[in-house]
């Protein structure tokens, strides 16, 4: 906490400029008007303030806006955002995607911090749902963002937003999350033709039920083994040998290398040996 002291003669700041880097913390506290700071926040990031000087500037804003900063200030926080606590951020009302982008840019290249997680949570809750533009933005900065959400939170994603999802965005999703996302993807891509549909739906198939896998097996999709290994075991078990052969196409030979791993292992054990022998892969049920 900086002591309240009078500003020395001639040092009162008339604007936020580089001369302030030479001010001691107590001088910043005494000589910089909080309202001036709020209107010139965009300049702060162009000036090499030390971390402790930034603490003083934050303190001045906190005093000016005890109920939370207005968005006009938030949008220009820049590196000062890194000084904010989740408690500070919970007081904010962030509605502009531009503000969100500006603050995510500050944290770019780092893991998602508690501050960023709180900011995103406030933003999404304010919007009521995870729309396409927001999802586009969030997955661009944090490819794993989608998979960090609970199934309940994912249920607020409208099918139209699924178009923004890239395969890598789903890399860390677990089956419960894919169970929620798959029906949305199916709805989003329903008007696409066979091959294009498969390219889009492929990343979501970890949430597909048996009947959809059966339908895909009729469409010459040539699913790769990596995708097959991510399918739900309970969805794979009822498939016949012929259906799996059609589903995988030329990739069916890969079953041999995966025969000890789920879901292949469990599927093999459910099949008649005669049927497995038709594959000519030496699989033992």
């Amino acid at each position: 906490e900086v002591e309240k002291t009078a500003c020395p003669s001639g040092k009162k700041a008339r604007e936020i400029d580089e001369s302030l880097i030479f001010y001691k913390k107590w001088e910043l506290e005494a000589c910089v008007d909080a309202a001036l700071l709020a209107t010139q926040m965009d300049r702060v990031n162009a000036i090499p303030f030390t971390y402790e000087q930034l603490d003083v500037l934050k303190h001045k804003l906190d005093e000016l806006y005890p109920q939370g900063y207005p968005e006009s200030v938030i949008q220009h926080l820049g590196y000062l955002f890194l000084k904010m606590s989740p408690e500070d951020i919970r007081k904010w009302n962030v509605t502009s995607l531009e503000t969100l982008k500006a603050l995510l840019e500050v944290n770019k290249g780092h893991e998602m911090s508690p501050q960023v997680a709180t900011l995103i949570d406030r933003f999404v809750k304010g919007r009521g749902q995870l729309d396409k533009d927001t999802l586009d933005t969030l997955t661009a900065f944090y490819p794993g963002y989608l998979c960090s959400l609970s199934p309940e939170e994912l249920s607020s994603v409208p099918p139209s937003s699924i178009w923004a999802v890239r395969p890598q965005d789903l890399d860390t999703c677990d089956p419960r999350q894919l169970d929620v996302l798959y029906p949305k993807a199916r709805l989003a891509f329903q008007n696409m033709n066979g091959s294009e549909y498969f390219v889009k739906i492929q990343s979501f198939l970890g949430g597909a039920p048996t009947e959809d896998l059966k339908a895909l097996s009729q469409q010459n999709v040539s699913m790769d083994l990596a995708t097959f290994m991510k399918l739900r075991t309970d969805a794979v078990l009822p498939l016949t040998v012929a259906e799996v052969q059609k589903l995988l196409g030329p990739h069916v030979e890969g079953l041999k290398a995966e025969e000890r791993h789920r879901p292949v292992r469990d599927w093999i054990l459910r099949q008649r040996q005669d049927d497995l022998d038709t594959l000519g892969l030496g699989l033992q049920g």
Epitope: I21, F22, Y23, K24, K25, E27, L28, P48, T50, Y51, E52, Q53
Partner: nanobody, 122 residues
Framework: QVQLVESGGGVVQPGRSLRLSCAAS????????MGWVRQAPGKEREFVAA????????YYADSVKGRFTISRDNSKNTLYLQMNSLRAEDTAVYYC???????????????WGQGTLVTVSS
């Protein structure tokens, strides 16, 4: 004790270029910025340029933007200031600084060089 030694100053005509160097006698740990500050005769000190730790962010005073470039060579422990299109008003003593102290650039634990004089005159 780390020392900063500036070099490269001198007399130069307007419109010409000069490159200042600042060599550190040892590795400076934990600095937040390395930068250049200048002081013209009878005037206040003025920030010129700075570079943050890890060369993540570059800062320039409005008066030198587009003309001066700050850089550093970690392998040589040296900071540079490339000054192009020099003007008479750039005449000053240029100081190199390593900012470690949280209490501003005038904090007690920062390192400063002795300065090198740049005179821009026809």
């Amino acid at each position: 004790q780390v020392q900063l030694v500036e070099s490269g100053g001198g007399v130069v005509q307007p419109g010409r270029s000069l490159r200042l160097s600042c060599a550190a006698s040892g590795t400076i740990f934990g600095y937040q910025y390395m930068g250049w500050v200048r002081q013209a005769p009878g005037k206040e000190r003025e920030f010129v340029a700075a570079i943050s730790y890890g060369s993540i962010t570059y800062y320039y005073a409005d008066s030198v933007k587009g003309r001066f470039t700050i850089s550093r060579d970690n392998s040589k422990n040296t900071l540079y200031l490339q000054m192009n299109s020099l003007r008479a008003e750039d005449t000053a003593v240029y100081y190199c600084a390593a900012i470690l102290d949280g209490d501003g650039w005038d904090g007690g634990y920062n390192y400063w060089g002795q300065g090198t004089l740049v005179t821009v005159s026809s």
